[in-house]
Interface confidence: medium
């Protein structure tokens, strides 16, 4: 059926230029791969505020993820990942933005920190939601477990962890098979 | 060519109530968070309210909250300020704005403003 | 909150002049810091958003710098229409303003 698929990536300090980017084309090469499917894509930076880069409507406009990501600024400040998935949830998956009635709602988050708000993401629960924590701070299994809380269950299936932002090149094949 | 317009604003009684409105145009209005931003005579600006985008969220200035209510409708791109309960120190002139990006805070295209006079 | 403090409050120029206005934030906010113009009985309008990135349609003779705490808005030849009152304001958490700053014909 239709998969109506958002990225919801980390946009903050943390990241360094060369990370951002490697973001950047992981999300790209999943868009690539999945050119002629019955998924739709859209992007949302976050930090301390969040900005849709690209909806679907754009996608389905510009099918071109070198494009459609093309003037994308890093934002460098904060990790507002509560309030950035809940922007998604109200604000992205919405049907006069190009979103699908009848499509299975999915959410890839990608960061590189802890969540620097707090807050519920109960508008979320429709959604299935991944997310990959890459990097230095997601080195302990404490921090590793704040980010269960932005998943869906279980764990196992829904959060990633990768040691570095390398990895995120190999991801796409795992992840392929659990959507 | 952007535009907000805002109406709705004038002389109103200490208690009274004021609905401003701000028309938009030349824009996706219903992809943008707005922004209702005071001026008193003579003075700084201050902001008053938000709303995002679907209408889902609002936000008020502690000054405001619990008088003033925020809306908006996406089918007429057109955004609201209900005001009730209205004191002397909310006599101001009104604008109506609308934001770079999702929750920049920063504002972008300002209307012309309407003016409210609190007074007995 | 975050208090955002101008300076100076007014200041006196002639058309060719190069005029400079600094804004001091009581906190660090990255580069969320944006820059409006007003004149007499008309609405703000966006001269500058984060820090440096010119509104679309606003002279080049305008510019932003800094981060962090201290901005700067430079004029670098004031021309008649820019005789005005400026306002920096974050937008790094809920926005605040400075309190103004007027332009005048010296």
């Known amino acids: 059926g239709n998969v109506d698929l958002v990225f919801l990536f980390d946009g903050s300090m943390s990241l360094q230029p060369d990370e951002f980017q490697k973001i950047l084309d992981f999300m790209k090469d999943v868009m690539k791969k999945l050119s002629n499917t019955s998924y739709q894509f859209a992007a949302v930076q976050f930090s301390t505020s969040y900005k849709t880069e690209f909806d679907f409507s754009d996608y389905v406009k510009r099918k071109d993820p070198d494009a459609l990501l093309k003037h994308v600024k890093h934002m460098l400040l904060l990790t507002n990942t509560f309030g950035a998935i809940n922007y998604v949830a109200t604000e992205v998956f919405r049907e006069e933005l190009g979103a699908r009635p009848d499509a299975t709602k999915v959410l890839i988050i990608i960061t590189d920190g802890e969540a620097t708000d707090s807050g519920n993401i109960d508008a979320a629960k429709d959604i299935i939601r991944y997310i990959i924590g890459i990097g230095k701070h997601f080195q302990t299994k404490e921090s590793q477990e704040t980010l269960h809380k932005f998943a869906s269950k279980p764990a196992s299936e829904f959060v990633c962890i990768l040691d570095t932002f390398e990895c995120l090149k190999d991801l796409f094949t795992e992840l392929q098979k659990k959507i | 060519e952007v535009q907000l317009l805002e109406s709705g604003g004038g002389l109103v009684q200490p208690g009274g109530s004021l609905r401003l409105s701000c028309a938009a145009s030349g824009f996706t209005f219903s992809r943008y968070v707005m922004w209702w931003v005071r001026q008193a005579p003579g003075k700084g600006l201050e902001w008053v309210s938000y709303i995002w985008p679907s209408g889902g969220n609002t936000y008020y200035a502690d000054s405001v909250k619990g008088r003033f209510t925020i809306s908006r409708d996406n089918s007429k791109n057109t955004l609201y300020l209900q005001m009730n309960s209205l004191r002397a120190e909310d006599t101001a002139v009104y604008y109506c704005a609308n934001s770079y990006d999702f929750r920049s805070n920063a504002f972008a295209v300002w209307g012309q403003g309407t003016m409210v006079t609190v007074s007995s | 909150d975050i208090q955002m403090t101008q300076s100076p409050s007014s200041l006196s120029a002639s058309v060719g002049d190069r005029v400079t206005i600094t804004c001091r934030a009581s906190q660090s906010i990255g580069s969320y810091l944006n820059w409006y113009q007003q004149k007499t009985g008309k609405a703000p309008k966006a001269l500058i958003y984060?820090?440096?990135s010119l509104q679309s349609g606003v002279p080049s003779r305008f510019s932003g710098s800094g981060s962090g705490t201290d901005f700067t808005l430079t004029i670098s030849s004031l021309q008649l229409e820019d005789f005005a009152t400026y306002y920096c304001q974050q937008s790094y958490s809920t926005p605040s303003f400075g309190q103004g700053t007027k332009v005048e014909i010296k």
């Open positions: 984060a820090a440096s």
